[in-house]
């Protein structure tokens, strides 16, 4: 059975990520997916109201990074 996402972290740990290990937050479909399902990101067209790329959110990605910026498909950290 899958384990639920966890958000408790040490003070110096990376920012929480919703995904279980081996899964990444997909910025196109807006939920966690198996990291292997992520495709090569494409640049986001200027003015797009929805994210164009299919890319992953890293656990340590800084908040505010654009949805069109490439992110390595790293698994979530528990």
């Amino acid at each position: 059975m899958r384990r639920g996402p966890r958000s408790l972290r040490g003070r110096d740990a990376p920012a929480p990520t919703p995904c279980v290990p081996a899964e990444c937050f997909d910025l196109l479909v807006r939920h966690c997916v198996a990291c292997g399902l992520l495709r090569t990101p494409r640049p986001k067209p200027a003015g797009a109201s929805s994210p164009a790329p299919r890319t992953a959110l890293q656990p340590q990605e800084s908040v505010g990074a654009g949805a069109g910026e490439a992110a390595l498909p790293l698994p979530g950290l528990l």
């Epitope: 059975m1 899958r2 958000s7 920012a15 929480p16 990520t17 919703p18 995904c19 937050f25 910025l27 479909v29 807006r30 939920h31 966690c32 109201s49 929805s50 994210p51 959110l57 656990p59 990605e61 908040v63 505010g64 990074a65 654009g66 949805a67």
Partner: antibody, heavy 118, light 107 residues
Framework: QVTLKESGPTLVKPTQTLTLTCTFS??????????VGWIRQPPGKALEWLAH???????YYNPSLKSRLTITKDTSKNQVVLTMTNMDPVDTATYYC???FGYGLDYWGQGTLVTVSS | DIQMTQSPSSLSASVGDRVTITCQAS??????LNWYQQKPGKAPKLLIY???SLHTGVPSRFSGSGSGTDYTFTISSLQPEDIATYYC?????????FGGGTKVEIK
Amino acid sequence: QVTLKESGPTLVKPTQTLTLTCTFSGFSLSTSGMGVGWIRQPPGKALEWLAHIWWDDDKYYNPSLKSRLTITKDTSKNQVVLTMTNMDPVDTATYYCARSFGYGLDYWGQGTLVTVSS
Amino acid sequence: DIQMTQSPSSLSASVGDRVTITCQASQDISNYLNWYQQKPGKAPKLLIYYTSSLHTGVPSRFSGSGSGTDYTFTISSLQPEDIATYYCHQFSELPWTFGGGTKVEIK
């Protein structure tokens, strides 16, 4: 403890604009992957997803209502606001806000009943 | 949009009975499915997420399974407090959609 609470008018007149506020605690909308959205439920009927906003300010709307909806967030106030224009009696429903964090909607507010009548 | 067809729309069972609700998606949703319980006058509560994972604090008599387009929610032994309407919810793709609900009553 995650909590969400909806506030806004209980009665609006046809053609008016509805503004609902979701005030939440126990999480931050600046956290990567976090989202808050709105769902409604007409009396005795099923749930209908309306709109959602994420930590990175991306917004999504139900296509059937997109022209009438606007969702915004105020991260510092822990609030998400939904506006719905041109209200009609068929929009009478309980409106819920709910959180998402990677796996669909997990925590919901108590809901607020909005009646549209002249 | 992905259509979610939930059945039955209502059922009546005795305390202790095994209750099964099904949800069929109009296309493959790859296990991105949740189940909620809604009691009269209350907000929905998440019971099962991601097809089979039990949400925090939910009794183990609730379970979920399925894949592709077909999903099942089970109450292994119905309790009086389980009287409610149950909904499935797909978050595979936007717009997110819900099943029509199943009202569970006690015989």
